[in-house]
């Protein structure tokens, strides 16, 4: 999906209002310095691409993020503020239902959510070039 035409400010507002708090809840008990952020993004569409990938694509050691509250709210925000996004996700959602697993918060998942926080931070606060 091409995130270029999303309403970035509305997604930012959704993140600051709710999604960020869910990420904090997920990371509770973890020091913010525990993980080194290595995933970066260059602009807002790229950030959303990386955020979608880390949030919804199962990775080795962390297969369970898509059912977390922050993930569901992320999905809702993208569906509302990115034209045509929800249509692209129908097949992915059906595939996910088939492989639903018990939620387990692994260290790998905590590290992945720490990376997500860094991506969201970058998405929210791109350095604005002055014209």
């Amino acid at each position: 999906y091409d995130f270029t035409n999303c309403d970035f400010e509305k997604i930012k507002a959704a993140y600051l209002s709710t999604i960020s708090k869910d990420l904090i809840t997920y990371m509770s008990g973890t020091k913010s310095t525990e993980f080194n952020n290595t995933v970066s993004c260059s602009n807002r569409p790229h950030c959303l691409t990386e955020i979608q990938s880390l949030t919804f694509n199962p990775t080795a050691g962390c297969a369970s993020l898509a059912k977390e509250m922050f993930a569901m709210k992320t999905k809702a925000a993208l569906a509302i503020w990115c034209p045509g996004y929800s249509e692209t996700q129908i097949n992915a959602t059906q595939a996910m239902k088939k492989r639903r697993k018990r939620k387990v918060t692994t260290n790998k998942c905590l590290e992945q959510v720490s990376q997500l926080q860094g991506l969201w931070r970058r998405f929210n606060r791109p350095l604005l070039k002055q014209q």
């Epitope: 931070r121 929210n124 350095l127 604005l128």
Partner: antibody, heavy 120, light 111 residues
């Protein structure tokens, strides 16, 4: 706990340049915007510019655009602010500051400040 | 540039009394329903310290006698019951538009 430690006080001649460093410790450096703010004696706060160390992208206050250069060295977790063509009005305390964890945009960690005096 | 104007420039309030500082932006600092306005406290010889973010949210470790309100262009910082340690200069800051700008500061003293 994240800390920002700045270089020591400087006394400079008008027309010269000064380069102030800001070393971060105790946390991730590359994925946080780092800002520079100055405060002239008895005056308020003035934003100079910022850098995203992850890719070196910068944003400057147009007031300083031709005189200020902000850089970062990821390998040493250090940000730098260089101000050229110094004049007496540049006498101030220069602070580096890091944005918060959540992308709210507030400055939650500050350096101790570096006093730069410009005098002939 | 967005100009931030604080009032008053200085304020003297008795211990235990309410202190109110206003900040007006030359244009709205709101975006998508959120106000991108922060408040800082600065004591002599120290860097500023965050008090409130996004107009009304308390910073970490800030006592609840501090509160903030407002949206658009007009914002208020209130200290419900002034304590001796609240003597400082207070600054508002907008981050909605580059360049980021601060108010000129309000000096709060004890009467």
């Amino acid at each position: 706990e994240v800390q920002l430690v700045q270089s020591g006080a400087e006394v400079k001649k008008p027309g010269s340049s000064v380069k102030v460093s800001c070393k971060a410790s105790g946390g991730t450096f590359s994925t946080y915007n780092m800002h520079w703010v100055r405060q002239a004696p008895g005056q308020g706060l003035e934003w100079m510019g910022a850098i995203y160390p992850g890719n070196g992208e910068t944003s400057y206050n147009q007031k300083f655009k031709d005189r200020v250069t902000i850089t970062a060295d990821k390998s040493t977790s250090t940000a730098y602010m260089e101000l050229s063509s110094l004049r007496s009005e540049d006498t101030a305390v220069y602070y580096c500051a890091r944005e918060d964890d959540y992308g709210e945009g507030y400055f939650d960690v500050w350096g101790q400040g570096t006093t730069v005096t410009v005098s002939s | 540039d967005i100009v931030m104007t604080q009032s008053p420039d200085s304020l003297a309030v008795s211990l235990g009394e309410r202190a109110t500082i206003n900040c007006r932006a030359s244009e709205s600092v709101d975006n998508s329903g959120l106000s991108f306005m922060h408040w800082y406290q600065q004591k002599p010889g120290q860097p500023p310290k965050l008090l409130l973010y996004r107009a009304s949210n308390l910073g970490s470790g800030i006592p609840d006698r501090f509160s903030g309100s407002g949206s658009g262009t007009d914002f208020t910082l209130t200290i419900s019951s002034l304590q001796a340690e609240d003597v400082a200069v207070y600054y508002c800051q907008q981050i909605n538009t580059d360049p980021l700008t601060f108010g000129q500061g309000t000096k709060l003293e004890i009467k």
